[in-house]
């Protein structure tokens, strides 16, 4: 049910990366506005993005309260300029989103190689521990803080002069790898949550190569 001049939202889709979480939907409004509500399975509905003409709503502030909870959102449609109007059943028209569990479903953002340091035939490659919008005790948590040992990184590395690649894994944000003396290497990393069944891997980081400014070389 609903008013005669409103249409229900459809294609409700969660877009989430490193817990920055936006609900998107269609259609672009014509003579109508939207309000979004979000709730955990057992909680109360909270309204967000009141009477908006946008077709997206940033729900990050709500889901970061507990990223392991499962959330449901719904989008209400109202006639523009008459938001008190309801449908014949006494309720505005609305559509439910799919369920969303941030810890299990947020996409892993593209990682960044923070630095690499060569000492003799060893190279230490450090991955930037990206800050998320998840808070604990008024401080923002990093990706590692949130996921702990559930998060691993895969490193791909190769000699600049050849195509043969090697790989390594770490459950910290650092790799210590063996390299051939006098050779320059290139590096790329990928974040992985092996326990997941979807959204398991990030895209690869930008490639960083030795001999460029990001690294440091020390002969010992």
């Amino acid at each position: 049910s609903g008013t005669t001049n409103t249409v229900a939202a459809y294609n409700l889709t969660w877009k989430s990366t490193n817990f920055k979480t936006i609900l998107e939907w269609e259609p672009k409004p014509v003579n109508q506005v939207y309000t979004v509500q979000i709730s955990t399975k057992s909680g109360d509905w909270k309204s967000k993005c009141f009477y908006t003409t946008d077709t997206e709503c940033d729900l990050t502030d709500e889901i970061v309260k507990d990223v392991k909870q499962t959330y449901l959102a719904r989008v209400f449609s109202y006639p523009a300029g008459n938001v008190e109007s309801t449908g014949s059943a006494g309720e505005p028209l609305y559509e439910n989103s799919p369920e969303f569990t941030p810890y299990l479903e947020t996409n892993l953002g593209q990682p960044t190689i923070q630095s690499f340091e060569q000492v003799g035939t060893k190279v230490n490659v450090t991955v930037e521990d990206e800050r998320t919008l998840v808070r604990r005790n008024n401080t923002f948590l990093s990706l590692r803080d949130v996921f702990g040992k559930d998060l691993i990184y895969t490193l791909y590395y190769w000699k600049s002069s050849s195509s043969g690649k090697k790989t390594a894994k770490t459950n910290t944000n650092e790799f210590l790898i063996d390299v051939d003396k006098g050779e320059n290497y290139c590096f790329s990393v990928q974040a992985v949550i092996p326990s997941r069944t979807v959204n398991r891997k990030s895209t690869d980081s930008p490639v960083e190569c030795m001999g460029q400014e990001k690294g440091e070389f020390r002969e010992i």
Epitope: K166, T167, K169, T172, Q190, P194, S195, R200
Partner: antibody, heavy 117, light 107 residues
Framework: QVQLLESGAVLARPGTSVKISCKAS????????MHWVRQAPGQGLEWIGG????????MYDPKFQGRVTITADESTSTAYMELSSLRSEDSAVYFC??????????WGQGTLVTVSS | DIQMTQSPSSLSASVGDRVTITCKAS??????LSWYQQKPGKAPKLLIY???SLADGVPSRFSGSGSGTDYTLTISSLQPEDFATYYC?????????FGGGTKVEIK
């Protein structure tokens, strides 16, 4: 459910090449890594190499470098392993396996490759 | 390359025995170690992943322990279906390497 179905047994001449396929079902191969392992008669397991179907990166044991090519076709959910310049000591059962990041958790049934003149 | 030294290479045991198999890596592999059971003519079957986690459907008599360079697979009470060959695998860095295998036979 997750399954890896390998192509059938192969008899090959020394010096030729063999290409084995591994058809995945029950998961999206680009979300995982795909590896190849072989086992000669009465011997242990030997890693040949692996591939990340999401970005095309392939890694090989240096022992096979230059002789092996591991690829994946996301559109058909199939991983491939091609081994060239075959010799008699390449006679073995070849397994494909899915790597979750924590382990090789699912394996194909194995493909017997016999190299003989 | 990381070497994996698995011991013993074979052992004889009776049903109900406690069996321990060890793998030692030549360098720290950060728990990227898994254990497999293989029976003749079959593909390996995952038992333990990430050094200590029991794979789905694997009986609780199997357990894994260890960190750094030293890892152990324990079968608390050997059952008739456990007579097989067991392998460890390090996948912390390429080339990935298997242990040489442990054949568990009936005494």
């Amino acid at each position: 459910q997750v399954q890896l179905l390998e192509s059938g047994a192969v008899l090959a001449r020394p010096g030729t090449s063999v290409k084995i396929s591994c058809k995945a079902s029950g998961f999206n191969i680009k979300d995982y890594y795909m590896h190849w392992v072989r086992q000669a008669p009465g011997q242990g397991l030997e890693w040949i190499g692996g591939n990340d179907p999401a970005n095309g990166h392939s890694m090989y044991d240096p022992k096979f470098q230059g002789r092996v090519t591991i690829t994946a076709d996301e559109s058909t959910s199939t991983a491939y392993m091609e081994l060239s310049s075959l010799r008699s000591e390449d006679s073995a059962v070849y397994f494909c396996a899915r790597d979750s990041g924590y382990a090789m958790d699912y394996w194909g049934q194995g493909t017997l490759v016999t190299v003989s003149s | 390359d990381i070497q994996m030294t698995q011991s013993p290479s074979s052992l004889s045991a009776s049903v109900g025995d406690r069996v321990t198999i060890t793998c030692k890596a030549s360098q720290d592999i950060k728990s990227f170690l898994s254990w497999y059971q293989q029976k003749p003519g079959k593909a390996p079957k995952l038992l333990i992943y990430y050094a200590t986690s029991l794979a789905d459907g694997v009986p609780s008599r199997f357990s894994g322990s260890g960190s750094g360079t030293d890892y152990t697979l324990t079968i608390s009470s050997l059952q008739p279906e456990d007579f097989a060959t067991y392998y460890c695998l390090q996948h912390g860095e390429s080339p990935y390497t298997f242990g040489g295998g442990t054949k568990v036979e009936i005494k």
